[in-house]
């Protein structure tokens, strides 16, 4: 009678991660008596996957009954199939012995490759708030995925961005794959509003891509700009000044009135306006007393944004000629408008 | 840290059916190789597994009590029952919910223990 | 089913000394299959050695297991005061898992 051949009729065997793995084996005779054994691997160091004579297999069902006694089918199911079940697998015919059954006849192995999806990319920016003109870096981390081959690209506001840098690790082979990628991004005064996009396109995606964004509200600041103007009000010895504070994001600020550099007045910016590219915009004033001055005074706005150093604009309010009254200033009927006696 | 806790009624009818569940904490059940499972100690007598049940849903069972147990885990995977009907008198026992741990290579023990609840059954 | 027959039943023995339990199974089993189980009184039991001869978590080196096929041994070395407790062995390798009828182990 022709000698036992273990015949594992599959090279290879690709699966999708979450899923069940058919591994095919079959013997071409009864004799010897004695399990077969499936292992990943081959040498001393394999591992193994499945013993018809004892043990617990949970994620491994056979595909046939193997208590029948004519059984020359030993093909196994490994079910949750993770790229970590990735491998050459073994079918391995034993002959009962004593005490220990010995190793009688191994299939050639069936490599089992496992597809698996990236994870979501996530998008992570600076630390800290950059200015427009700064260049800011952000980086994209998606893991997870096999075979290793995959796409990255970058978007900002949907245009494909050229600068940047990435890796796939590890190197070498592995169960899985991890991609790290750094983009450069310069920044414009118009980037409140702005998404900056990362991409990654897979085999196990089908065509759709996985994206990860980052808005760059949380990386731009946009520093205001300031103007101090005079305007004269109804009563002929008030003056009222304005600090106009423009163009600014976050929205986080502090402003200051100082009178001949004396802290006069602080307040936080509360009801802003805010603009068509997502700046704020902001006004505070004071109403001035200039009855009974003899010197000219200087009026400094003092903003501290988003809390960096503050920046300033000064007026020089002139006492010497008293402005005339040229009718109703709205903002100065605004309730949050703050009357300033000058001695 | 692990902790199982069984729950159930103290006493049952004969020929009524045993509802046990066991609420854990400490880990999950979605976690590859983790199962649940339990095991049962007459008065006085020795442990005798009674099933479990694994991370992937598959259901193990001993052969005596098969025709009347089912064992199962909620969608929300922090809780295991057990059911087993027609109960007698035998079926008496402290009843203890088990943690089984797949270790790879075919092996699998009782790692976590909750500390077992009384059922008795009687008219 | 796997029959597992422990011996002896009871052993008395005083601390200090060294105590040796058997467990004998009706079928050959390869020794990573084979656990030891410690019950005090009025507790749950407690994984003690797993594989034959691995001590579980926060278990002392006085305990130890060997064996091969079809007969185990647990030895504990110098009987501490408590040690004395029920000793189980059971087996994983084919379902459904079976334990040992068990050995009380108590002060002389």
């Known amino acids: 009678e022709e000698e036992l051949q273990v015949i594992q009729p599959d090279k290879s065997v690709l699966v999708a991660a979450g899923e069940t793995a058919t591994l095919r084996c079959t013997a071409t005779s009864l004799i010897p008596v004695g399990p077969i054994q499936w292992f990943r691997g081959a040498g001393p160091g394999r591992e193994l996957i499945y013993n018809q004579k004892e043990g617990h297999f949970p994620r491994v069902t056979t595909v046939s009954d193997l208590t029948k006694r004519n059984n020359m089918d030993f093909s196994i199911r490994i079910g949750n199939i993770t790229p970590a079940d990735a491998g050459t697998y073994y079918c391995v015919k034993f002959r009962k012995g004593s005490p220990d059954d010995v190793e009688f006849k191994s299939g050639a192995g069936t490599e089992l490759s496992v597809r698996a999806k990236p994870s979501a990319p996530v998008v992570s920016g600076p630390a800290a708030r950059a200015t427009p003109q700064h260049t800011v870096s952000f980086t994209c981390e998606s893991h997870g995925f096999s075979p290793r081959d995959i796409t990255l690209k970058w978007f900002k506001n949907g245009n494909e961005l050229s600068d940047f840098q990435t890796n796939v690790d590890p190197v070498g082979e592995s169960v899985s794959y991890s991609i790290h990628s750094t983009a450069k991004v310069v920044l414009t005064r118009e980037d409140v509003h702005s998404q900056v996009i990362c991409e990654v396109a897979h085999v196990t995606l089908q065509g759709d891509p996985l994206r990860g964004t980052a808005n760059l509200s949380e990386t731009i600041r946009v520093p205001p700009t300031l103007e101090v103007t005079q305007q004269p009000v109804r009563a002929e010895n008030q003056v009222n000044v304005t600090c106009q504070v423009r163009k600014f994001y976050p929205q986080r600020l502090q402003l200051t009135w100082l009178e001949n550099g004396n802290v006069s007045r602080t307040e936080t910016a509360s009801t802003v306006t805010e603009n068509k590219d997502g700046t704020y915009n902001w006004m505070s004033w004071l109403l001035v007393n200039v009855s009974a001055h003899r010197d000219d005074v200087k009026l400094t706005c003092q903003v501290e944004h988003d809390g960096q150093p503050a920046v300033s604009k000064s007026h020089d309010l002139k006492v010497s000629a008293h402005p005339k009254e040229q009718g109703s200033n709205t903002a100065a009927e605004n309730t949050g408008s703050n009357e300033r006696n000058i001695y | 840290q692990v902790q199982l806790q069984e729950s159930g009624p103290g006493l049952v009818k004969p020929s009524e059916t045993l509802s046990l569940t066991c609420t854990f904490s400490?880990?999950?059940?979605?976690?590859?190789?983790?199962?649940m499972g339990w095991i049962r100690q007459p008065p006085g007598k020795g442990l005798e597994w009674i099933a479990h049940?694994?991370?992937?849903?598959?259901?193990y069972y001993s052969s005596a009590l098969q025709s009347r147990v089912t064992i199962s885990k909620d969608t929300s995977k922090t809780q295991v029952s057990l059911k087993l009907s027609s109960v007698t008198a035998a079926d008496t026992a402290v009843y203890y919910c088990?943690?089984?741990?797949?270790f790879g290579s075919g092996q699998a023990w009782f790692t976590y223990w909750g500390q077992g609840t009384l059922v008795t059954v009687s008219s | 089913e796997i029959v597992l027959t422990q011996s002896p039943g009871t052993l008395s023995l005083s601390p200090g000394e060294r105590a040796t339990l058997s467990c004998s199974s009706s079928?050959?089993?390869?020794?990573?299959?084979l656990h030891w189980y410690q019950q005090k009184p009025g507790q749950a039991p407690r994984l003690l050695i797993y594989?034959?001869?691995n001590l579980a978590s926060g278990i002392p080196d006085r305990f130890s297991g060997s064996g091969s096929g079809t007969d185990f041994t647990l030895t504990i070395s110098r009987l501490e005061p408590e040690d004395f407790a029920v000793y189980y062995c059971?087996?994983?390798?084919?379902?459904?898992?079976?334990f040992g009828q068990g050995t009380k182990l108590e002060i002389k």
């Open positions: 088990v943690r089984i741990d797949y």
């Open positions: 400490g880990f999950s059940l979605n976690t590859y190789d983790i199962g």
């Open positions: 049940i694994w991370w992937n849903d598959r259901e």
């Open positions: 079928s050959t089993i390869s020794s990573t299959y």
């Open positions: 594989g034959t001869s």
């Open positions: 059971q087996q994983g390798s084919r379902i459904p898992f079976t």
